[in-house]
């Protein structure tokens, strides 16, 4: 019978700067039922608030919906673990939504083999930004990265596409089936997960670039 061990807020992520979620790891188990609560205040304010939504993000999480998410404000948050023996507190975590954006993967990745008559053939791919991200407002600059590999190969070949939503690759092995994926990241923030793999069969008569 011990008080709970010290919890740790280990991750906060936002898909689009409009909402965000934080997750914590419980500390050691005191062998008793333990309640967790996340409290926060905005830097410069003294009023403490409790997590508005413990459900949406899954176990040991706190989700901040649109009405609780402010840009350009730092959130100071802490998790309290309590059982009948006492309470333990996490270290405070300072969160600025601008720097925790992890977008959803890009959408609608299409890949084609192009074989123009007058030039070398190439692989052409295009995609769309994730729907939650509104690029028109200028709030976001999204950067993209592509990776591809022959189906049975172990190593991926990675290409940085910058802000483009299309890309060409010239050096490919004829007759191979390739997996292609794309991911994105905001200028300040984290890479998204890779998009689902798109498969493309390279024709046997595809001419390698010299």
């Amino acid at each position: 019978q011990l008080p709970p061990g010290k919890p740790e807020i280990f991750k906060c992520r936002s898909p689009n700067k409009e909402t965000f979620t934080c997750w914590w790891r419980p500390g050691t188990d005191g062998g008793l039922p333990t309640n967790y609560s996340l409290t926060y205040h905005r830097e410069g304010e003294t009023l403490m608030h409790e997590c508005p939504d413990y459900i949406t993000g899954g176990p040991n999480s706190c989700h901040f919906g649109k009405q609780y998410t402010s840009m350009w404000r730092t959130y100071v948050m802490m998790v309290n673990a309590t059982n009948q023996m006492g309470s333990s507190f996490s270290d405070e975590l300072y969160v600025d939504v601008t720097y925790i954006v992890q977008p959803d993967p890009p959408l609608e990745l299409t890949v084609e083999v192009k074989q123009p008559e007058d030039r070398k053939p190439y692989l052409w791919m295009k995609w769309s930004p994730p729907t939650l991200i509104d690029l028109k407002t200028g709030w976001f600059t999204l950067l993209y990265e592509i990776r591809l590999k022959p189906e049975k190969a172990a190593e991926w070949e990675t290409h940085f596409a910058g802000q483009q939503t299309e890309f060409k690759i010239l050096s490919l092995h004829p007759g191979q089936k390739y997996l292609v994926q794309v991911r994105c990241k905001p200028d300040h923030g984290y890479w998204s997960a890779w998009s689902p793999a798109t498969f493309i069969q390279i024709p046997s008569d595809f001419i390698m670039n010299d």
């Epitope: 019978q1 062998g31 009948q84």
Partner: antibody, heavy 117, light 107 residues
Framework: QVQLVQSGAEVKKPGASVKVSCKAS????????ITWVRQAPGQGLEWMGW????????DYAQKFQDRVTMTTDTSTTTGYMEMRSLTSDDTAVYYC??????????WGQGTLVTVSS | DIQMTQSPSSLSASVGDRVTITCRAS??????LAWFQQKPGKAPKSLIY???SLQSGVPSKFSGGGSGTDFALTISSLQPEDFATYYC?????????FGQGTRLEIK
């Protein structure tokens, strides 16, 4: 009201085993556990270990690790402490205690275990 | 293991006196400290938990203080029923450990 009622005094021979019970009532047994503390004659209090009625977890003081077993039975709301290979140094009053709302807020009346040849 | 050192080991005082018993932990125990009173032939009784919080039903003449490694129990005005042995206990980590006790006697 909360009560912890322990089994009666025991006299044991060296090398024997003893099993002390602690019957709990008046609170939700399954959200706590039973801790065992002993006190040799004229000596201080010594924590022996505990058994969780919540998740079955047990923790023992190292000196008792090899010869003590603590259990809780939620169907009878009873905690048990069994000690094997008794010696005269184990002569003591054995107390059970629990956590209802606050740390160690309720105690049993104690069980005297005498080890003598 | 965390060692708990109580002082003094015995103390003589008169009815009406204010007395303080101290307890030092060998490392920081995050204020997870309890105080118990024990009378001869009786089970310990919890007085204080979390260094300074009074257990339900315990008179306010008992108070606890301190933090980190140094703690104290103060009895503000001794009554005949307060003469007993007092123990501190840390419950910050296993093994839970007690101080060696302070015997409070009538002068």
């Amino acid at each position: 009201q909360v009560q912890l009622v322990q089994s009666g005094a025991e006299v044991k021979k060296p090398g024997a085993s003893v099993k002390v019970s602690c019957k709990a009532s008046g609170y939700t047994f399954g959200t706590s556990g039973i801790t065992w503390v002993r006190q040799a004659p004229g000596q201080g209090l010594e924590w022996m270990g505990w058994s969780s009625a919540y998740n079955g977890k047990t923790d023992y003081a190292q000196k008792f690790q090899d010869r003590v077993t603590m259990t809780t039975d939620t169907s009878t709301t009873t905690g048990y402490m069994e000690m094997r290979s008794l010696t005269s140094d184990d002569t003591a009053v054995y107390y059970c205690t629990t956590v209802v709302r606050r740390p160690f807020d309720f105690w049993g009346q104690g069980t005297l275990v005498t080890v003598s040849s | 293991d965390i060692q708990m050192t109580q002082s003094p080991s015995s103390l003589s005082a008169s009815v009406g006196d204010r007395v303080t018993i101290t307890c030092r932990a060998s490392q920081d125990i995050n204020n997870f400290l309890a105080w118990f009173q024990q009378k001869p032939g009786k089970a310990p009784k919890s007085l204080i938990y979390a260094a300074s919080s009074l257990q339900s039903g315990v008179p306010s003449k008992f108070s606890g203080g301190g933090s980190g490694t140094d703690f104290a129990l103060t009895i503000s005005s001794l009554q005949p029923e307060d003469f007993a042995t007092y123990y501190c206990q840390q419950y910050s980590s296993y093994p839970i450990t007690f101080g060696q006790g302070t015997r409070l006697e009538i002068k």
